[in-house]
């Protein structure tokens, strides 16, 4: 059976939207009005992995872009990057672990924990127009809480 996917946008708890800044970077910044069209639409695929009531494994692809968020070690540190995939083979139910995030729902907010690197989360900075990254702390300066807005296909 084909993998189930939905289209959505994500905003951090400060209401910053995510946009592609150049070919290799995802940034978080406040958008208004027509600029909202710049925000990245994700295709969130529900994939194989450890699942519980509040924890669901997903992959986050940029809609129709062949690019997925992935987690790899760089300088011995878990790092978030975009990775290109062959559109003929992705998305798939059994995604490689580097593409998998545990979507955790707490008090109507979402966290995205790397399946490859437990306790590392998709994060944004308090500052405007900074890269989205993988952070190893929750509840500190950096933001790990998001809201999801559904987008019709």
């Amino acid at each position: 059976a084909p993998v189930r996917s939905l289209n959505c946008t994500l905003r951090d708890s400060q209401q910053k939207s995510l946009v592609m800044s150049g070919p290799y970077e995802l940034k978080a910044l406040h958008l208004q009005g027509q600029d909202m069209e710049q925000q990245v639409v994700f295709s969130m695929s529900f994939v194989q992995g450890e699942e519980s009531n509040d924890k669901i494994p997903v992959a986050l692809g940029l809609k129709e872009k062949n690019l997925y968020l992935s987690c790899v070690l760089k300088d011995d540190k878990p790092t978030l990057q975009l990775e290109s995939v062959d559109p003929k083979n992705y998305p798939k139910k059994k995604m490689e672990k580097r593409f998998v995030f545990n979507k955790i729902e707490i008090n109507n907010k979402l966290e995205f924990e790397s399946a490859q690197f437990p306790n590392w989360y998709i994060s944004t900075s308090q500052a405007e127009n900074m890269p989205v990254f993988l952070g190893g702390t929750k509840g500190g300066q950096d933001i790990t809480d998001f809201t999801m807005q559904f987008v019709s296909s």
């Epitope: 592609m20 290799y24 710049q38 790899v72 760089k74 975009l82 990775e83 995939v85 062959d86």
Partner: antibody
Framework: QVQLVQSGAEVKKPGASVKVSCKAT????????IAWVRQAPGQGLEWMGS????????NYNEKFKGRVTMTRDTSTSTSYMELSSLRSEDTAVYYC?????????????WGQGTLVTVSS | EIVLTQSPATLSLSPGERATLSCRAS??????????MNWYQQKPGQAPRLLIY???NQGSGIPARFSGSGSGTDFTLTISRLEPEDFAVYYC?????????FGQGTKLEIK
């Protein structure tokens, strides 16, 4: 500074295999993908595949799937490309190149190339 | 796969002149408003050298006379004033979709 140094020229018979090496220096080998691109005499460039040494992940061009294998040795910061069942049309210069970012970045550093000649 | 067609195949110009090289893709190579097209220069017996990435960004150490433009399916490399060392083969390459593909090249020769 970043350098990719490849192994020397090879002459192979049809049906044989060849293994070309690419030693990386001047950066953290496991942080960047390595791509392999070939160029037949007087022809254009053709991407064969890529490998991420930090996790041993690969992308292969469908055209070469089943014939090409990309591996790495992190202890020596060396990437390898092995092509099997060689035929005369595989005669080419084989380059390793480093994408600037992830697996899809532009190729900002290149090896000097390795000429592989397939001839009976 | 995305096919890239370069034109002309050969361009004969003199030093000091302006060179315009074209690359057309079989489908759009834009992603989020960014053109995923790169340009390389190759001289005989040498490896390719990056000139332009993401359609219009100069590679490290590339002289200002090299510029790139375009979006969607049509891209252009312009050399504003040709120097003797610019005579070489130029390739475009798309990095929007696997497999990465290159154009067949444009040979820039001295008239």
């Amino acid at each position: 500074q970043v350098q990719l140094v490849q192994s020397g020229a090879e002459v192979k018979k049809p049906g044989a295999s060849v293994k070309v090496s690419c030693k990386a220096t001047g950066y953290t080998f496991t942080d960047y993908w390595i791509a392999w691109v070939r160029q037949a005499p007087g022809q254009g460039l053709e991407w064969m595949g890529s490998i991420f040494p930090g996790g041993d992940y690969t992308n292969y061009n469908e055209k070469f799937k089943g014939r090409v294998t990309m591996t790495r040795d992190t202890s020596t910061s060396t990437s390898y490309m092995e092509l099997s069942s060689l035929r005369s049309e595989d005669t080419a210069v084989y380059y390793c190149a480093r994408p600037y970012y992830s697996n899809y970045g532009h190729f900002d550093y290149w090896g000097q190339g390795t000429l592989v000649t397939v001839s009976s | 796969e995305i096919v890239l067609t370069q034109s002309p195949a050969t361009l004969s110009l003199s030093p000091g002149e302006r060179a315009t090289l074209s690359c057309r893709a079989s489908e759009s190579v834009d992603n989020s408003g960014i053109g995923f097209m790169n340009w390389y220069q190759q001289k005989p017996g040498q490896a390719p050298r990056l000139l332009i990435y993401a359609a219009s960004n100069q590679g490290s150490g590339i002289p200002a006379r090299f510029s790139g433009s375009g979006s969607g399916t049509d891209f252009t490399l312009t050399i504003s004033r040709l120097e003797p060392e610019d005579f070489a083969v130029y390739y475009c390459q798309q990095n929007k979709e696997l497999p990465w593909t290159f154009g067949q090249g444009t040979k820039l020769e001295i008239k």
